[in-house]
């Protein structure tokens, strides 16, 4: 429809009590320059007066020349293309609809923008890749649908409550398309990180806690094994018995198969967690280990060197 004014701005902006909101906005009027601008809160059209009713937060003909440091609401735009707004501080009762009433010489327009102000700082959102595998570098992303020039914030990463050593890259967007603050952390998780809690903490400029989001790491890894042998020194005489036990300390996902290897070769029919060698002979000396597999791959225990001595 060519008889419309053209506006570009984020559809909804988010903030919390006491913070601020910066609303990037561009427009194109139907004819010539803007003559006046009124910012309404929750405007309603009054058919009797043919005018809009609602709280007037800003009126260009009144507020345009009031020193900006005295104004909670500022119109940072101009009369032909910029309609950027700032509300600082923003309050809970500012939530609702902002109505930008624009008037040129012959045309009028009401543009609406949604403002969602929460009582307390809302939490950021941690985004993880669909799968995390041990020793493979991944990027953890923490996203907050907030950014405002008058209210600096920071996002900090914690692992089990301890600040992560890796350097995070923080970026902000304050454009007509999107408003957000994002922190990205490159991280090579080890199997021991599986099940650990990662936190993205929102802090103010002074490092004061505002809110956080937490996730539990799901690190896919091959089974991690411990091998135990009786006798513990793995030195026996011919005819003695030896017992080796394979313990799975961690596996994600669950293991599927178990096998034993001697000198790198699989022992047939040995598919349990216990390897019993009865009346051993000298030729059974060698390096033993257990191998347990899951969907990620096989995990091997350390090798045990069995020495069978003459009786």
């Amino acid at each position: 429809d060519s008889s419309k004014w053209v506006f570009e701005h984020p559809e909804t902006l988010y903030a919390w009590e006491g913070a601020c909101v910066w609303i990037p906005c561009t427009y194109r009027a139907l004819d010539g320059d803007l003559e006046s601008f009124i910012l309404f809160h929750n405007p309603e059209y009054n058919k009797n007066t043919s005018k809009f009713d609602g709280t007037r937060l800003y009126e260009s003909t009144k507020d345009g020349k009031v020193p900006s440091e005295q104004k909670r609401v500022q119109f940072l735009g101009d009369k032909n293309k910029n309609c950027t707004l700032s509300i600082h501080p923003v309050h809970l009762n500012d939530s609702g609809q902002l109505g930008l009433r624009m008037e040129s010489k012959t045309e009028k327009w009401m543009e609406r923008i949604h403002l969602n102000v929460s009582e307390r700082p809302f939490p950021p959102h941690i985004q993880l890749p669909p799968e995390i595998q041990e020793s493979q570098e991944v990027t953890l992303t923490c996203l907050l649908n907030f950014s405002c020039y008058g209210y600096p914030i920071q996002l900090q990463w914690l692992l089990e409550g301890v600040p992560m050593r890796q350097a995070a890259v923080t970026s902000t967007s304050l454009t007509i398309k999107s408003v957000f603050t994002r922190s990205e952390l490159k991280f090579s998780p080890q199997w021991s990180h599986h099940g650990k809690i990662v936190t993205c903490q929102l802090q103010d400029a002074d490092g004061k806690f505002l809110s956080n989001d937490t996730v539990q790491l799901n690190v896919k890894h091959t089974p991690k094994l411990e091998i135990k042998v009786t006798p513990s020194d793995a030195i026996v005489r011919e005819g003695d018995s030896v017992t080796m036990t394979c313990e799975v300390s961690s596996s994600n996902p669950e293991y599927t198969t178990v096998s034993w290897l001697k000198d790198g070769t699989s022992l047939k029919k040995q598919n349990t967690f216990t390897l019993n060698l009865r009346e051993v002979t000298k030729d059974q000396s060698g390096k033993y280990c257990c191998q347990v597999s899951n969907d990620v791959g096989p995990g091997r225990s350390e090798e045990v060197f069995l020495q069978v001595q003459y009786a």
Partner: antibody, heavy 120, light 112 residues
Framework: EVQLVESGGGLVQPGGSLRLSCAAS????????MNWVRQAPGKGLEWVGR????????NYSGKFKGRFTISADTSKNTAYLQMNSLRAEDTAVYYC?????????????WGQGTLVTVSS | DIQMTQSPSSLSASVGDRVTITCRSS???????????LEWYQQKPGKAPKLLIY???NRFSGVPSRFSGSGSGTDFTLTISSLQPEDFATYYC?????????FGQGTKVEIK
Amino acid sequence: EVQLVESGGGLVQPGGSLRLSCAASGYEFSRSWMNWVRQAPGKGLEWVGRIYPGDGDTNYSGKFKGRFTISADTSKNTAYLQMNSLRAEDTAVYYCARDGSSWDWYFDVWGQGTLVTVSS
Amino acid sequence: DIQMTQSPSSLSASVGDRVTITCRSSQSIVHSAGNTFLEWYQQKPGKAPKLLIYKVSNRFSGVPSRFSGSGSGTDFTLTISSLQPEDFATYYCFQGSQFPYTFGQGTKVEIK
């Protein structure tokens, strides 16, 4: 055509009061700042203060605060300057002037002025 | 308060002369929004002032092109490139950036 017409001037004794009126026409009165400016005989211009008729907000030059009060009646499209405790040095021509733009700001329309003489 | 000091206080000139009036503010009159609300008004005896220049250098509609404004920060100038008979008047600079708004004391341009 945008017009401002002042009235209410005249001779008043020291210590007396006077209310000047500025009747506006030809524009939306409630949506422009109205300023009062005065000029003593043979002297320069002096800004007194201003009012936004839409909500009654005012700003004053410090030397007039307390003695002078600016008000407006949107139903009559008229701004007022109430002057109390008048002194001889308040003798001047008083002008009302409209702040005429949302963006550029200037006194684009002035009234013809009304003379106030404070004398015993 | 911001003082606006004009110089000269008066000058005599002939038709066709180039006339320059300066105005100096006691402090910067850049408004917090970034604009400089510096205006020039012309006043003839017994008449209300008339706007010539706004925001330092913008000519008001209907004002002849021989009038121009320039300057920044604290120093401003009104120039009449070729004085005409109807230009003999008193000229005032005005700052509308900070309260209280203030006028210069005026410069009277007389016929030589």
